[in-house]
């Protein structure tokens, strides 16, 4: 009759398939992102509460604070599963963590691939987002700062051109618009003037009423969509690095959780085996 498998004699009853290194590496790895997620939620909530009353009118879909809260909450729940699952050696929580992380990774991968394959549709979506942001420019301070930063960074104005600012009710260029900003563009569209120490926030006033040639003496006339697309094309390696930077922690998390799940399963098998054969004279 063949001998039954048994635990290595050296470690006796204390032997475990669960590696403390894997277990605590996964725990601290999740703990780090758990803390980050809480900070994200806290910053998001703070930003949302600190906004003016009229921010309630803002389009939530483009609100960076809401985006921060949503991502933070999802990250919190995910890393919570990872933390508790690794600490308590809970297969159910670890499998949930692993599956969710895999799903997130695959979604990101799919978005990236689809973005390249359907670049025209991706461009259309970017246009839609930018135009929506233009419409809500004055409704949300965070969004306003983001647009101003983008226009200054990429030396551009509007989506396709500076005249896109007419989509905003304050900057609308119809002759009966009562707004003092009628036909204007934000100061972030203005060309830098080295001689001016203080930014002239009125420099974009009435600029939509001028043609490209005249407006280009004062403001950026090129839209931000083309500038953004050109920037993406010329920074593909950088974007690839960022994508890799996001993918590596996810892949590490998936790998560690799967290793730990397999180790826990082996440990359970060992415990069941030991329970079944305690009375075995061969043991």
């Amino acid at each position: 009759m063949a001998r039954r498998p048994r635990a290595p004699a050296a470690s006796g009853e204390e032997f475990s398939f669960v590696s403390p290194l894997v277990k605590y590496l996964l725990f601290f790895f999740n703990m780090l992102f758990w803390v980050i997620s809480m900070v994200m939620v806290a910053v998001g909530v703070y930003a949302r509460l600190m906004k003016h009353a009229e921010a309630a009118l803002a389009c939530l879909a483009v609100d960076p604070a809401i985006l921060l809260i949503v991502v933070g909450v999802l990250m919190f729940l995910l890393t919570f599963c990872g933390c508790i699952g690794s600490l308590r050696e809970n297969i159910c929580l670890l499998q949930t963590f692993s599956l969710c992380l895999t799903a997130v990774f695959l979604l990101q991968l799919a978005a990236g691939i689809l973005g390249f394959v359907f670049s025209d549709k991706a461009r259309g979506k970017v246009s839609e987002i930018i135009n929506n942001a233009i419409v809500h420019y004055r409704d949300d301070l965070d969004l306003q700062n983001l647009i101003d930063f983008g226009q200054k960074k990429f030396s551009c104005c509007g989506g396709i051109s500076y005249k896109d600012w007419s989509q905003n009710m304050y900057f609308n260029c119809s002759e009966d618009n009562p707004s003092r900003e009628r036909c204007s563009v934000p100061y972030s569209c203005c060309l830098p003037t080295p001689d001016q120490a203080v930014i002239n926030t009125m420099c974009g006033q009435g600029m939509q009423a001028f043609d490209y040639l005249e407006a280009s003496k004062v403001i950026y006339t090129n839209g931000c969509i083309d500038k953004l697309v050109n920037w993406i094309h010329s920074n593909l390696f950088l974007l690839g690095g960022v994508a890799l930077g996001l993918a590596i922690p996810q892949l590490v998390g998936i790998l560690l959780s799967q290793i730990l799940v397999n180790q826990i399963k082996d440990q359970i098998k060992l415990q069941l085996y030991n329970q079944q054969h305690r009375a075995d004279p061969w043991y």
Epitope: S174, E175, P178, R182, C183, Q205, A209, F210, D211
Partner: antibody, heavy 120, light 107 residues
Framework: EVKLVESGGGLVQPGGSLSLSCAAS????????MTWVRQPPGKALEWLVF??????????EYSASVKGRFTISRDNSQSILYLQMNALRAEDSATYYC???????????WGQGTTLTVSS | EIQMIQTTSSLTASLGDRVTISCRAS??????LNWYQQKPDGTIKLLIY???RLHSGVPSRFSGSGSGTDYSLTISNLEQEDIATYFC?????????FGGGTKLEIK
């Protein structure tokens, strides 16, 4: 350099008709609203009509004093603005100016003016 | 329609003087106020738009101020070439309307 040159003024009998022209240069004509403003001798300026730009479908807006009698039009291929005046009255006697009108509500460039006299 | 009133129809000043021309609107025009200069030969030029912004090529001695219904044009150091009639105009609503004008003469 933006330049506007009016022509076509003269002496007309009451009830008569006349067409004024304004040749524009130095800017993208289709991108701008164009307008006519008049000034009777020794009096203030009076806005008459404007025609919107390409983006706004070249639609028109008239003052109550000339609506139904005057017609504004533009030849975008030649950058010329027109004002067709019918059923002229003695009170229409004035210097007629063509100007570039901005949606911000100002007339940033003006022509030198052309004089219309309505008299029998 | 909005009425534009220039109470002073003519003004006499000496060269080098600081001259202020005023204009009043019949309702709030939210700073959509422009100033024009008409020379004796009939030529018209935009001087100031949106209350205080100098049009390109206009000397810095010209300045504008005001809000609501009351606005003014100031010439800080009157020169011979400034002898003209000055008109204010509101661009807040259609129809755009002009003031009666202020004729500036030399003493």
């Amino acid at each position: 350099e933006v330049k506007l040159v009016e022509s076509g003024g003269g002496l007309v009998q009451p009830g008569g008709s006349l067409s004024l022209s304004c040749a524009a240069s130095g800017f993208t004509f289709t991108d701008y609203y164009m307008t006519w403003v008049r000034q009777p001798p020794g009096k203030a300026l009076e806005w008459l009509v404007f025609i919107r730009n390409k983006a706004n479908g070249y639609t028109t807006e008239y003052s109550a004093s000339v609506k139904g009698r005057f017609t504004i039009s533009r030849d975008n291929s030649q950058s010329i603005l027109y004002l067709q005046m019918n059923a002229l009255r003695a009170e229409d006697s004035a210097t007629y100016y063509c100007a570039r009108y901005l949606q911000t509500g100002n007339f940033d460039y003006w022509g030198q003016g052309t004089t219309l006299t309505v008299s029998s | 329609e909005i009425q534009m009133i220039q109470t002073t129809s003519s003004l006499t000043a000496s060269l080098g003087d600081r001259v202020t021309i005023s204009c009043r609107a019949s309702q709030d025009i939210s700073n959509f106020l422009n100033w024009y200069q008409q020379k004796p030969d009939g030529t018209i030029k935009l001087l100031i738009y949106f209350t205080s912004r100098l049009h390109s090529g206009v000397p810095s001695r010209f300045s504008g101020s005001g809000s609501g219904t009351d606005y003014s044009l100031t010439i800080s150091n009157l020169e011979q070439e400034d002898i003209a009639t000055y008109f204010c105009q509101q661009g807040y609503t259609v129809p755009p309307t002009f003031g009666g004008g202020t004729k500036l003469e030399i003493k």
